[in-house]
């Protein structure tokens, strides 16, 4: 009932809780002298569905019959209009549409731990959308029952609070969940059950590893478990992967050895147990141990390649590079690299270790045989050393690779192709691709990155530290035996026409004909390869097309002569630089007017 | 979903007469009052009248009163319009309606109307 309802009364028939798709008849009756003024047929009753008028009759009652009313709860009032007035609150009555609740189904029982207390749960059916009320039952030896209610609108979840002890492991226990409301009742299928069933045990705890000798190979992992613990697994995985390693143990007694660890790597492991074989349930998993393994001494060996530069008549400069170990290789923390120089026919050697870099550059004499091994050393050893032999790697030109083309290969990628050399192709033992950013002045501080290839490849696809709107120098060597044999050519990924043209600094005059003197274009402004520069020159004041001077380009050259210029003749010149993708903006202009003779 | 399809209406000369109906589907009828509502050319919605649900109380506005009927079918889930003696200011379109008041301002609800149907009293 809403309000006081002093003025009348709303009744609802047959119930206020009623079955969904069940009709109710909804009566407001007004109580003697409650009406309007005057007589009866003044009197306009009007039946409100929620905030919306629905019915009205005149008189003192009214009678409404509905259908269709949906699940949950919907309120009517009953209001009373009079002629010239505001509407009067009689009464109202809120209606309950629901459904009989359904079987519970799937009822399950679990004991967290061996001091636990019993807890179940099942699932309700669908929602009744009415007071449900659900008591759970235990009933277990020696006519022993244990009782809980629940009064939750929501209610699959009971625990009884009492503890299931292991003194009669076999014993069953019974348990049943029955759900009452106003529309009817129903009951769970029964659940039985013995201790060693539900009993779910905690996690294990004070999980440990220890490593004897400081070895990866000797690794024993330590934990705590409730005491009838029979059965453990375990799983692991380095932190970084997704997918673990499971092992089933077997009266583990709180320690198991794993013997198939990768060194220097960072482990997460994890546990749970069980209290019997074929009976129970797994414990939830153990909060999580990470680990570091220890290092071993690296396997593998260094890729290493070297670059020599003549320095005068008895000197020449080797730089060497080697690439850093793989993660796996390196097993551990990389210290230093140990490089050592031989004279093989001397036997001078000069050992080195290198920290903080991949290169090393040294001067050595140009006569002799000299040959380089090159290690990685981490806390327990050292990779076993790459051995070099040094030699001119472009020296025999029957070895040099045929036809070398560089072609951009989507983004920020080059496909370099070439043709076996000319002498015996089954010679090449292998290829070696290497590339660094094309810098004017052959600055030997630039990084170079090589790639290997096998004998019978005849491309390859170079993508590490390649940027767009970059030149790049690529070399192709063949290397057989302690020969080698090399091609170069430019390349770049994605280019376009160059920002600016090169700067004139100077124009001079040579007997009778002109030398222009340029500046390179800086790198960035290059925006790829450059193929050519053009040199345009036209009369002063004149409207005339410029003349021009394709040059290609080289790039250690700077100035170029230009013999058809008249004498006495001001001319203004300017340059412009090319790309594959276009021309350039002009660079500076500069007048110049030859003296010499006129013929 | 709610439909109401009104039909019945026409050209019709002054004091002739006219019987609209009102079909409805998508709801339980029986459960409501019914109303027809009008709207003149240029002019504002007007209640017409209202029966309940089960056709035992009738109301009708001051301009209507005893030339219009309206009465109900639950079995036919039908609504209807008696009008006689019509006269050229009973040119409107007819809307019936849910009931939701006796008044021309309690129909700002939308959700029970019909498409309507066009009286024209003329000679």
């Known amino acids: 009932k809403i309000d006081a309802c002093k003025r009348g009364d709303v009744t609802v028939k047959p119930s206020h809780v009623i079955l969904l798709g069940s009709t109710v008849n909804i009566t407001c009756s007004l109580k003697p002298r409650q009406g309007c003024f005057h007589y009866s047929r003044r009197n306009k009753l009007i039946l409100y569905k929620f905030d919306r008028r629905i019915n009205f009759h005149h008189g003192h009652s009214l009678n409404s019959q509905v259908t269709g009313l949906p699940l949950g709860t919907t309120l009517f009032v009953c209001k009373l209009a009079c002629i010239n007035s505001d509407e009067i609150q009689i009464c109202g009555a809120e209606i309950f549409v629901g459904v009989a609740p359904e079987q519970p189904q799937n009822l399950s029982c679990i004991q967290k731990g061996e001091q636990g207390t019993v807890a179940c749960t099942w699932e309700r059916g669908r929602d009744t959308h009415l007071y449900t009320e659900y008591t759970l039952q235990l009933s277990g030896p020696k006519n022993l029952t244990w009782q809980k209610q629940c009064k939750d609108i929501y209610c699959d979840y009971l625990d009884f609070g009492i503890n299931l002890t292991p003194e009669s492991p076999e014993s069953n226990f019974t348990a049943k969940v029955t759900a009452v409301n106003s529309l009817g009742s129903s009951s769970s299928l029964p659940s039985t059950f013995t201790f060693l069933d539900i009993v779910r045990p905690l996690p294990p705890w004070d999980i440990r590893i220890k490593f004897q000798k400081a070895s990866v190979s000797r690794c024993t992992l330590y934990w705590r478990d409730e005491g009838l613990v029979l059965l453990n697994r375990l799983r692991y995985r380095p932190s970084n992967s997704r997918l673990w390693n499971m092992v089933n143990v077997t009266k583990a007694k709180g320690r198991h050895d794993l013997l198939d660890l990768k060194p220097f790597t960072e482990y997460e492991f994890q546990i749970s147990s069980k209290l019997h074989l074929y009976k129970g349930s797994w414990s939830d998993w153990s909060e999580s141990l990470r680990a570091q393994t220890p290092e071993e001494e690296p396997t593998g060996m260094l890729d290493v390649w070297y670059m020599k530069r003549h320095i005068d008549y008895s000197r020449q400069q080797i730089s060497l590079f080697w690439k850093n170990l793989s993660v796996s290789e390196a097993r551990g923390k990389i210290l230093h690299y140990q490089v050592t120089l031989q004279e093989l026919t001397g036997g001078k050697a000069m050992t080195q270790n290198i920290t903080g870099h991949t290169s090393w550059t040294t001067v050595i004499p140009r006569t002799g045989n000299w040959a380089v091994a090159v290690s990685a050393a981490n806390s327990k050893g050292s990779s076993l050393p790459t051995r070099i032999n040094i030699m001119n790697l472009c020296e025999a030109g029957l070895l040099a690779p045929r036809q070398v083309s560089a072609n951009s290969e989507g983004m920020d990628n080059i496909l370099v192709t070439w043709q076996p050399p000319r002498k015996d192709p089954s010679a090449v033992q292998e290829y070696v691709v290497e590339w660094r950013e094309l810098h004017p002045g052959g600055d030997t501080q630039v990084p170079l990155n090589w790639l290997r290839s096998r004998p019978y490849n005849v491309s390859a696809l170079i993508s590490e530290n390649i940027k767009s709107y970059i030149c790049y120098e690529i070399r192709v060597y063949a290397l057989s035996g302690d020969q080698g044999g090399c091609s170069s050519i430019l390349g770049n990924s994605k280019h376009k026409a160059p920002l600016s043209g090169p700067h004139i600094n100077a124009i001079t005059e040579e007997k009778g004909s002109i030398l222009i003197s340029w500046n390179s274009i800086p790198v960035q402004e290059q925006m790829g390869c450059l193929l050519h520069y053009r040199i345009y020159w036209k009369e002063r004041d004149s409207n005339s097309q410029p003349q021009l001077c394709e040059i290609p380009y080289r790039v250690s050259q700077n100035s170029h002569p230009i013999n058809s210029l008249q004498p006495r003749v001001t001319y203004v010149l300017w340059m412009t630089a090319l790309t594959a993708a276009g021309e350039s903006s002009h660079g500076n202009e500069r007048e110049f007017c030859l003296q010499g003779k006129a013929n | 979903q709610v439909q109401l399809v009104e039909s019945g209406g026409g050209l019709v000369q002054p004091g002739g007469s006219l019987r609209l109906s009102c079909a409805a589907s998508?709801?339980?009828?029986?459960?409501?009052?019914m109303s027809w509502v009008r709207q003149a050319p240029g002019k504002g919605l007007e209640w017409v009248s209202a029966?309940?649900?089960?056709?035992?109380?009738?109301s009708y506005a001051d301009s209507v009163k005893g030339q219009f009927t309206i009465s109900r079918d639950n079995a036919k889930n039908t609504l209807y319009l008696q009008m006689n003696s019509l006269k050229p200011e009973d040119t409107a379109v007819y809307y019936c309606?849910?009931?939701?008041?006796?008044?021309?301002?309690?129909?700002?609800?939308?959700?029970?109307w019909g498409q309507g149907t066009q009286v024209t009293v003329s000679s």
């Open positions: 309606t849910k009931w939701e008041g006796d008044t021309d301002s309690d129909y700002k609800f939308k959700d029970y």
């Open positions: 998508g709801f339980t009828f029986s459960n409501y009052a």
């Open positions: 029966i309940n649900s089960d056709g035992t109380s009738t």
